[in-house]
């Protein structure tokens, strides 16, 4: 399964929208900095596109879930948020089409469960952090910057997989 060229354009648009969503300077939120333990290993230790697709799907699904909460709607510009949802939704569709075609159903599907679980736990830590910080503007800014970083890392992997083929 070849992910359409529009998929990587969509990833770039998603990052651009995340950048545009910034409301306050991260420098004013230095006291709220936090290490969420992004499981980078899960995006670097699988060498076949087939193995990364379900993990990337989980990543995007979790970003979608995180930003489609009531608390998120109150934190961000509604127009940008709607565009953001649309981009994520399209990427999920692209990845799902690949899974349906049989990519991702390889000999070792169980090994991907570890990676998917690790991604879920990462987002669980983000959710706990927001709750702990009472969804403050600084907490959301820290999370927005973190999602930009982790999304960028995971999409870089997609690009490197595409170029290997």
């Amino acid at each position: 399964c070849d992910l359409p060229q529009t998929h990587s354009l969509g990833s770039r648009r998603t990052l651009m929208l995340l950048a545009q969503m910034r409301r306050i300077s991260l420098f004013s939120c230095l006291k709220d900095r936090h290490d969420f333990g992004f499981p980078q290993e899960e995006f670097g230790n699988q060498f076949q596109k087939a193995e990364t697709i379900p993990v990337l799907h989980e990543m995007i699904q979790q970003i979608f879930n995180l930003f489609s909460t009531k608390d998120s709607s109150a934190a961000w510009d509604e127009t940008l948020l709607d565009k953001f949802y649309t981009e994520l939704y399209q990427q999920l569709n692209d990845l799902e089409a690949c899974v349906i075609q049989g990519v991702g159903v390889t000999e070792t599907p169980l090994m991907k469960e570890d990676s998917i679980l690790a991604v879920r736990k990462y987002f669980q830590r983000i959710t706990l952090y927001l709750k702990e910080k009472k969804y403050s503007p600084c907490a959301w800014e820290v999370v927005r910057a973190e999602i930009m970083r982790s999304f960028s890392l995971s999409t870089n992997l997609q690009e490197s997989l595409r170029s290997k083929e």
């Epitope: 333990g37 469960e113 679980l117």
Partner: antibody
């Protein structure tokens, strides 16, 4: 009875290699992440590495990354750590540990083996 | 990496005394802080997980509290068999990190 039994420790020269094994019994090994934790004689505890329940996720302490490799064989209920380029600072008791969940982080280390001693010396 | 600081490094108390050990983390770990007991010549044993959850078989004189960055292990009434080293550990993210340990001695 739940049990973890380490083996493979011993004396090795600096720069040498060693492979430790840990056989698990009394619980569903394939359902839990596993770790290696070490303790230099008379010192505190240091986490070394973790592996997810299915062997797909592997995490390492910065002090061992690139030298140690953790793996597991769920069909034989066995956890391994391959240790290369050993230095005197790796001298310690190595404990095989069961985690409370299927994948590392946000977990506790709820069951420990008796430990196996690794001595790196000339 | 998350730094874990434990204090005191050692303490001496009498049987029946109330004993507290403190643990601080360099960033919030929510409630993902665990406590272990290690008796001389033995492997560690999990006492308390998730800051305050007592493991089965652990006497009720042990209790844990705290969240975020500050945690406490309390032994309400010290017993002779509690003579051991105690370690806290953050299980929030890898690398897992432990406190330096607290050696508890009976006077």
């Amino acid at each position: 009875e739940m049990q973890l039994m380490e083996s493979g420790g011993g004396l090795v020269q600096p720069g040498g290699s060693l492979r430790l094994s840990c056989v698990a019994s009394g619980f569903t090994f394939k359902s839990f992440a596993m770790s290696w934790v070490r303790q230099a004689p008379g010192k505190g505890l240091e986490w070394v590495a973790s592996v997810g329940s299915q062997g797909g996720s592997k995490y390492y302490a910065p002090s061992v990354k690139g030298r140690f490799s953790i793996s597991r064989d769920n069909s034989n209920n066995t956890l391994y750590v391959q240790m290369n380029s050993l230095g005197v600072e790796d001298t310690a008791f190595y404990y095989c540990v069961k985690e409370t969940d299927a994948v590392a982080t946000m977990d506790a280390l709820d069951m420990w083996g008796q430990g196996t001693l690794v001595i790196v010396s000339t | 990496d998350i730094r874990v600081t434990q204090s005191p490094s050692s303490l001496s108390a009498s049987v029946g005394d109330r004993v507290s050990i403190s643990c601080q983390t360099s960033q919030s770990v929510n409630i993902y802080l665990n406590w272990y007991q290690q008796r001389p010549g033995k492997g560690p044993q999990l006492l308390i997980s998730a800051a305050s959850t007592l493991q089965s078989g652990v006497p009720s004189r042990f209790s844990g509290s705290g969240s975020g960055t500050d945690f406490i292990l309390t032994i309400i009434s010290l017993q002779p068999e509690d003579s051991a080293s105690y370690y806290c550990q953050q299980g929030y993210i890898t690398p897992y990190t432990f406190g330096q340990g607290t050696k508890v001695e009976i006077k």
